[in-house]
């Protein structure tokens, strides 16, 4: 009985249920392709349970295998808009520590206005994920069109 | 020993493993943009473990953070077909209770025939999810082309 | 105390946390539409924890409901490339045992160069998943552009 009670009182984070869902805050200055994210109940339906934001980039707090997912929609976009510009590409990767820098997920907008994907990947405590949008088109800040999240799956 | 046995005998639903995967049943009448879903082993590979269907819409039975995913393919579609019609958009949202109404996920078919995406979002017991397909193109009913599901991730 | 220790010493696989993320190894010979996958830490960020590879195809080791996800990008592709060829389609399905053969997930590249999707589906021990790419375009082997994975979700 005492064991069951103790188990119930453990914080969820100790069970490894780290999870985050972020919404777009802003794009970077001209030479910075990174998207800057924000999260928290005050902002709507975004949240961080475990991971943290470091200058708009997502930092992992627990080692494990994560499901990383993202959707980015270009602002005021039609297939005509998309086809009239140089290819726009989104890449999600570990950007720090530099020793672990790697691209995890990459997609191009080919005459389309939205990309969406997901993948499983091992992440370590301290890994910071960056989402780089290359091209000159502005992403939508609508929370149902552009979002980025991670979910801890197993050690 | 008794504790371990008791734990094994708990129904899975009490562990919070609510999950559902649905297949398209039919579209609504002309002025109703909602897609109507169905699920159950008799229908193939669709199922509901926890959530329920209410007139073809998915109702949540357990509070928590959920992974919501969807794929919709337009019927007898080619990029030519898609480009000949006005933009078709899919939106997944909470449609009831009205006080919690919000769009969670939105994608347009831009000269494409399939949209697919997923996101993490908090849902509460009693939330009903609706999937609205605006535009005049009929979605495919093939179970490997059009489907909609949720998975409970954490409290 | 002894119970807690025993619990910690159980292998993760016994908790049902089967998971795999694979990278493309090669395509099949001309009349074989299957993609052949590989996985393991020596190859980068791919891994198999529970499921196994059988001649480049993914074999399931534990009954349950799985989240299956995939992304495939066509090599040296632009929307022009994609539109100039016969439709290229990706299908993920159970290919053996033959008695359980079924298509689970199907997407076409319509003037696009990448498809990405995911779904929940029941899988049984011994099910082998095949990913068939029909058409004459070569998929990218970049690990951030083409990948395939499964995650055990619940019994």
């Amino acid at each position: 009985q005492r064991f069951a009670q103790a188990q119930q009182q453990l914080p969820l984070e100790s069970l490894g249920w780290d999870v985050a869902e972020l919404q777009l805050n802003h794009t970077g200055p001209q030479q910075d392709p990174r998207l800057y994210w924000q999260g928290g109940p005050a902002l709507g339906r975004s949240f961080l349970h475990g991971p943290e934001l470091d200058k708009g980039q997502l930092r992992i707090h627990r080692d494990g295998i994560y499901m990383v997912h993202i959707q980015v929609t270009l602002a005021i976009c039609s297939s005509t808009t998309a086809s009239r510009h140089h290819p726009t590409t989104l890449a999600v990767g570990i950007c720090s520590p530099a020793s672990r820098s790697i691209s995890l997920l990459r997609l191009s907008f080919h005459q389309g206005c939205t990309i969406a994907s997901q993948r499983l990947t091992p992440l370590a405590r301290g890994d910071t994920l960056c989402t780089n949008l290359t091209g000159t088109l502005l992403p939508s800040r609508n929370t149902d069109e552009t979002f980025f999240g991670v979910q801890w799956v197993r050690p | 020993q008794r504790f371990a046995q008791a734990q094994q005998q708990l129904p899975l639903e009490s562990l919070g493993w609510d999950v559902a995967e649905l297949q398209l049943n039919h579209t609504g009448p002309q002025q109703d943009p909602r897609l109507y879903w169905q699920g159950g082993p008799a229908l193939g590979r669709s199922f509901l473990h926890g959530p329920e269907l209410d007139k073809g819409q998915l109702r949540i039975h357990r509070d928590g953070i959920y992974m919501v995913h969807i794929q919709v393919t337009l019927a007898i579609c080619s990029s030519t077909t898609a480009s000949r019609h006005h933009p078709t958009t899919l939106a997944v949202g909470i449609c009831s209770p009205a006080s919690r109404s919000i769009s969670l996920l939105r994608l347009s078919f831009h000269q494409g025939c399939t949209i697919a995406s997923q996101r993490l979002t908090p849902l509460a017991r009693g939330d009903t999810l609706c999937t609205n397909l605006t535009g005049t193109l009929l979605p495919s009913r093939n179970t490997d082309e059009t489907f909609f599901g949720v998975q409970w991730v954490r409290p | 105390q002894r119970f807690a220790q025993a619990q910690q010493q159980l292998p993760l696989e016994s908790l049902g946390w089967d998971v795999a993320e694979l990278q493309l190894n090669h395509t099949g010979p001309q009349q074989d539409p299957r993609l052949y996958w590989q996985g393991g830490p020596a190859l980068g960020r791919s891994f198999l924890h529970g499921p196994e590879l059988d001649k480049g195809q993914l074999r399931i080791h534990r009954d349950g409901i799985y989240m299956v996800h995939i992304q495939v990008t066509l090599a040296i592709c632009s929307s022009t490339t994609a539109s100039r060829h016969h439709p290229t389609t990706l299908a993920v399905g159970i290919c053996s045992p033959a008695s359980r053969s079924i298509s689970l997930l199907r997407l076409s590249f319509h003037q696009g160069c990448t498809i990405a999707s995911q779904r929940l589906t029941p899988l049984a021990r011994g099910d082998t998943l095949c990913t068939n790419l029909t058409g004459t375009l070569l998929p990218s082997r970049n690990t951030d552009e083409t990948f395939f994975g499964v995650q055990w979700v619940r019994p």
Epitope: - | A75, I76, S83, L138, T143, E145 | -
Partner: antibody, heavy 120, light 111 residues
Amino acid sequence: QVQLQQSGPGLVQPSQSLSITCTVSGFSLTTYAVHWFRQSPGQGLEWLGVIWSTGITDFNAAFISRLNINKDSSKSQIFFKMISLQPNDTAIYYCGRNSYYGNLYAMDYWGQGTSVTVSS
Amino acid sequence: DIVLTQSPTSLAVSLGQRATISCRASKSVSASGYNFMHWYQQKPGQPPKLLIYLASNLESGVPARFSGSGSETDFTLNIHPVEEGDAATYYCQHSRELPLTFGAGTKLELK
């Protein structure tokens, strides 16, 4: 209520062109596609072409070089033109509204038909 | 192009009896979970009237005496019980792809 009203000549000289106007009411041409057909004793019902809600057109390959369809959505009118008519083009010509679903291609309302005779 | 073959070319049925008309396509018109076959009724001097869409769905306002069935390449229109106003020519039409094509028609007469 939904209506499609056709107007056009009954007699056309060989090698001349045929113009028919289909004026619609009860629905918008920015939402619905309109197809064109003809019916003759020899050929039965033939699909000629379609103008989609977006203004894009598709034609039967057998008529593509002789056919043009355009519209003025603000006036609820579709204009059908076929050139170089021959006696075997004698038929009743119909416009028909595509049902609500753009990829269904079933006609839920039809014009009354324009009987065309090609003769000198 | 998909060729539709209707049979019979004509039939005579007594009031209250069943009329059955067949339509065979030269290739499958089933796709995306639907059967892209429709049925029309045409009376002399009038345009065709949609009766059944997607093989088995009754168009609004059409009596339930009309029913359709079939899939892939073989489709059937049933009228039961036949009434006086049903004397007409019936056409099948596919919409699996462009160009749309019609069957040659089946003329239903009342005995």
